[in-house]
């Protein structure tokens, strides 16, 4: 960390780059063990043949694509941030439920519910979620709209969460919000159903409040088509956890060294 | 940056700590004056004796208390972002001026002019800005608002540029609004009168949609109040940028070394 | 910046990332990740030169300043800038799991 | 963290941020800065050990790759992680000058 | 539905205690539970928390000279190794304000813990 | 390290009144946050969690509001009974904290 004057110009010292490379593996395997909390490889004894089963490839494809997105300037890394988050997806409660029922009249907002039991399944402890994003994939649409979303609040009431600008596509996108302090929150609270509004942004003066996006698996002229409704295309929670039993090592001592 | 297998553990190599603290000091003295485009300290003889101007203490000030309020976890910085940048004011076109006429009466919004002219001076080429904050300083207040930020786009429409949540504050406060984009686009166009409106959050059933925020300088209960109007405290645009002069090196090659 | 863009097109000497292929299987001899197969770590090499001056340089040394010491530390070091999680797929007994490790991939280095 | 509450409140020998402040009059012989008479630089030092290691070693040094590699670097340095910035008041001629001069302050430090 | 804290001594530095939070009414099978202390005239200042299942999370001062831990269905005990004169304080237990909440809806009435030679 | 700040340390106010107390928190909580009020010689109670919502038995005339870093408790129509120490709380981090308390707001009613 601090070299000698003379070194102030090393450009004349030869690297060996393949000493270097072989240093940065070595590493990179030491890295990924311990992110892992594994002290070696885990047994592949039991591994079932054959391919990884679809939802998983669907998860880790979620998860990929997400951090392709993503802008590759991380935040300084707290401590338990920087061991391995496991990935899960909770769909959101189906649109059949009676739960959905005083909604689908309401032209400026579509809603999405969840059920807390669901996440709890996924993340036990409200501790151990380092970020829950809500994916919802919007249909190919020719109009831009600004957007809003809320988080159900109180019997009538909504709390705004974000808002974004929907510029006009092609093809079908998927849509992310960070919405960890909401499903922290939810965590925190017994068990029940919890949701989401996704809504125009609604201007003083009351003009077009309507909304123009629609979302797979929501979109009211495709409530019929049960095969988009049924699929893994619906909005959905991804959620990246500490797992349990790793969560227990991270209280050892920040600074023993 | 790469170092000896042997070193791996140099706890016991004993670390000269004032040598280190010399060595950055140095490194400082470099820094500041590389970062300032200077070959060496400038010259003290043309200055007016006496203390700092006010205004130029109040700019101090205005830029000291941003920094306390930044996140200490920076971009990665662009070549240019490394220089210094010169730091002024832009005040928002005077409330008397006859453009305030026709949006007195509106009770969800306030609305804020300013002269690009003014703008240009104090950057003269839309390149050498690197950030513009609108910063308005808010009176005391008891309620809860959720406001949003709207740039004068064409005649009559507005675009929308951000929202904040304003929660209950017992002293005046600054608010600041990153419009670095706005004040760009403002420079590649010509001379004339630009603006913001700052609103209340309209939901989409259209309760309350009045404006519950007083802003110094602007609140129509306090114009009459010159002294307030006229006083530094008035919204404005505070704007980073490298200086004309200092410009023309950053298009020496970026990699020569 | 020194990202991959201006990094693998060029021959730095100096502070820079340089490219890294890391297959789990050949180069760890690991077949439990089972997706992805391998991936694009990355890493910074390369010296930091001027790290300190005395006023006598200035003239040569302040231009150098931006890349080769921009946080004016006594003994620069080429560190990474931007990183990039990176998710894997794995197995513990019967179950397959979906992880995401953190600032795994780098894609620039800085003199820090 | 590895950063001012932790490190100041404590004898870290590692990898930490060290206090300095830079009086501009008495530390570099300057004048001409107006305003601030001098600031909290602060700098990193302090080795980042255990940088790799062997199958052999792994109980032992895994558990530490968090503080002293959690980049996987082929050999870690202790450089600054938050950074702030330092305005600035001094005189071009006869006209007063605000600057805002970019990452000056070292918050926390990392082995990256 | 209560919580009573024990076992708050005068002690000696270098010494270890344990002290005993016991719940009346309830059982901490549902509840989340925390330790927290005050100084004499000082704010409050988290050590540490326990989960439904049994999880302790830590304060990062309070790492490894702090154990939290369930000894029953109604009973949480705090143990403190190596007490110095800065660890005098007030020593209160908390209850999670719902089943799976961190955030602090009932409290005992603390204990006291002094350190002095 | 999620570190909250609170201000002001102390303030007084007059019966009938208004009083503001600020929490900054040094990273996003996303409203995971409770507000607690202490007499002197008793514990901690309860007032506000998850930024806004009063806890049973708690008054209408204390307020929490915020979210992202900042968070505010405002106290309408004081009253006597109110003076108080009062606390904030993240609930968003457990492990990577020094303390999960601010600092506390003594509030004298006059």
């Known amino acids: 960390d601090y070299k000698d004057d003379d070194d102030k110009l090393s450009t004349s010292k030869t690297i060996d780059m393949e000493l270097v490379k072989r240093k940065r593996i070595e590493a990179i395997r030491g890295q990924i063990l311990s992110k892992l909390r594994l002290a070696s490889p885990p047994s592949q004894g039991e591994v079932p043949p054959g391919p990884l089963p679809e939802a998983v490839l669907a998860l880790y494809n979620s998860t990929r694509d997400r951090v392709a997105g993503e802008s590759a300037d991380p935040e300084p890394e707290p401590e338990a941030d920087y061991y391995a988050k496991e990935v899960t997806r909770v769909l959101m409660v189906d649109r059949n439920n009676a739960i959905y029922e005083k909604t689908k009249d309401i032209s400026h907002s579509i809603y999405m519910f969840f059920n807390t039991s669901d996440i709890r399944e996924a993340v036990p402890e409200p501790p151990l979620l380092s970020r829950a994003e809500l994916r919802l994939q919007r249909l190919k649409s020719s109009v831009e709209q600004h957007v809003e979303l809320y988080q159900k609040y109180s019997n009538n009431s909504w709390r705004y969460l974000g808002n974004r600008l929907l510029t006009p596509t092609d093809t079908p996108e998927w849509l992310s919000f960070d919405v960890t302090g909401v499903v922290r929150q939810w965590l925190n609270q017994g068990d029940g159903i919890q949701g989401f509004r996704f809504s125009a942004h609604c201007s003083c003066d009351s003009k077009d409040n309507k909304l123009h996006v629609e979302i797979n698996g929501i979109s009211p002229k495709r409530r019929g088509d049960l095969g988009t409704i049924h699929d893994m295309n619906r909005p959905f929670l991804l959620l990246m956890a500490t797992p349990l039993e790793r969560a227990q090592h991270l209280h050892s001592s920040r600074h023993r060294r | 940056d790469y170092k000896d297998d042997d070193d791996k553990l140099s706890t016991s190599k004993t670390i000269d700590m004032e040598l280190v603290k010399r060595k950055r000091i140095e490194a400082i003295r470099g820094q500041i004056l590389s970062k300032l485009r200077l070959a060496s300290p400038p010259s003290q003889g043309e200055v007016p004796p006496g203390p700092l101007p006010e205004a130029v203490l109040a700019l101090y000030n205005s830029t000291r208390d941003r920094v306390a309020g930044e996140s200490a976890d920076p971009e990665p910085e662009p070549e240019a972002d490394y220089y210094a940048k010169e730091v002024t004011r832009v005040l928002m076109v005077d409330r008397n001026n006859a453009i305030y006429e026709k949006t007195k009466d509106i009770s969800h919004s306030i609305y804020m002019f300013f002269n690009t002219s003014d703008i240009r001076e104090a950057v003269p080429e839309p390149p050498l800005l690197s950030r513009a904050e609108l910063r308005l300083q808010r009176l005391k207040s008891s309620v809860e608002q959720h406001v949003e930020l709207y740039q004068k786009y064409s005649n009559n429409s507005w675009r929308y540029l951000g929202n904040r949540l304003l929660t209950p504050t017992d002293t005046p406060e600054w608010l600041s609004f990153d419009v670095t984009g706005v004040v760009r686009q403002w420079l590649n166009q010509g001379d004339g009168i630009q603006g913001f409106r700052f609103s209340a959050h309209c939901s989409c059933d259209s309760k309350d949609n009045k404006l519950h925020v007083e802003i110094n300088g602007i609140s129509p209960k306090r114009r009459g109040d010159l002294g307030t109007i006229h006083d530094m405290n008035r919204p404005f645009l505070l704007l980073m940028a490298t200086p004309l002069e200092r410009a023309q090196h950053l298009h020496s090659s970026r990699h020569r070394r | 910046a020194l990202d991959t863009n201006y990094c693998f097109s060029s021959t730095e000497k100096n502070c820079c990332v340089r490219q890294l292929y890391i297959d789990f299987r050949k180069d760890l001899g690991w077949k439990w990740i089972h997706e992805p197969k391998g991936y694009h770590a990355n890493f910074c090499l390369g010296p930091c030169p001027y790290i300190w001056s005395l006023d006598t340089q200035y003239s040569k040394v302040l231009a150098l300043y931006n890349q080769h010491n921009p946080g004016a530390s006594a003994s620069p070091c080429c560190v990474p800038q931007a990183l990039e999680p990176l998710p894997i797929v794995y197995y513990v007994g019967r179950k397959p799991k979906v992880e995401q490790l953190s600032n795994m991939i780098v894609r620039s280095c800085k003199c820090s | 963290a590895l950063d001012t509450n932790y490190c100041f409140s404590s004898t870290e020998k590692n990898c930490c941020v060290r206090q300095l402040y830079i009086d501009f009059r008495k530390d570099l012989g300057w004048k001409w800065i107006h305003e601030p008479k001098g600031y909290h630089a602060n700098f990193c030092l302090g080795p980042c050990p255990y940088i790799w290691s062997l199958d052999t070693q792994y109980s032992k040094v895994l558990a530490l790759y968090n503080q002293h590699n959690p980049g996987a670097s082929a050999s870690p340095c202790c450089v600054p992680q938050a950074l702030e910035p330092l305005p600035i008041v001094y005189y071009v001629g006869r006209k007063p000058k605000v600057e805002q001069l970019s990452n000056m302050i070292v918050r926390s430090c990392k082995c990256s | 539905q209560s919580l009573e804290e024990s076992g708050g001594d005068l002690v000696k530095p270098g010494a270890s205690l344990t002290l005993t939070c016991t719940a009346s009414g309830f059982s901490f099978s549902s509840y989340w539970m925390s330790w927290v202390r005050q100084a004499p005239g000082k704010g409050l200042e988290y050590i540490g928390m326990?989960?439904?299942?049994?999880?302790t999370y830590y304060a990062s001062w309070a790492k490894g000279r702090f154990t939290i831990s369930k000894t029953s269905s109604t009973t949480v005990t705090l143990q403190v190794t190596s007490l110095t004169a800065a660890d005098t304080a007030t020593y209160f237990c908390a209850r999670g304000y719902v089943s799976n909440s961190n955030y602090w809806g009932l409290w005992g009435p603390g204990t006291l813990v002094t350190v002095s030679s | 390290a999620y570190d909250m700040t609170q201000t002001p340390a102390s303030v007084e106010v007059a019966v009938g009144g208004t009083v503001t107390i600020k929490c900054q928190a040094s990273?996003?909580?996303?409203?995971?946050l409770a507000w607690y009020q202490q007499k002197p010689g008793q514990p901690p109670k309860l007032l506000i969690y998850y930024a806004s919502d009063l806890a049973s038995g708690v008054p209408s005339r204390f307020k929490g509001s915020g979210s992202g870093t900042r968070y505010t408790l405002t106290i309408s129509g004081v009253q006597c009974d109110d003076a108080a120490t009062y606390y904030c709380q993240q609930y968003w981090s457990s492990s990577n904290v020094d303390n999960t308390f601010g600092g506390g707001t003594e509030v004298v009613v006059k």
């Open positions: 990273q996003n909580i996303g409203s995971n």
């Open positions: 326990i989960s439904i299942i049994g999880t």
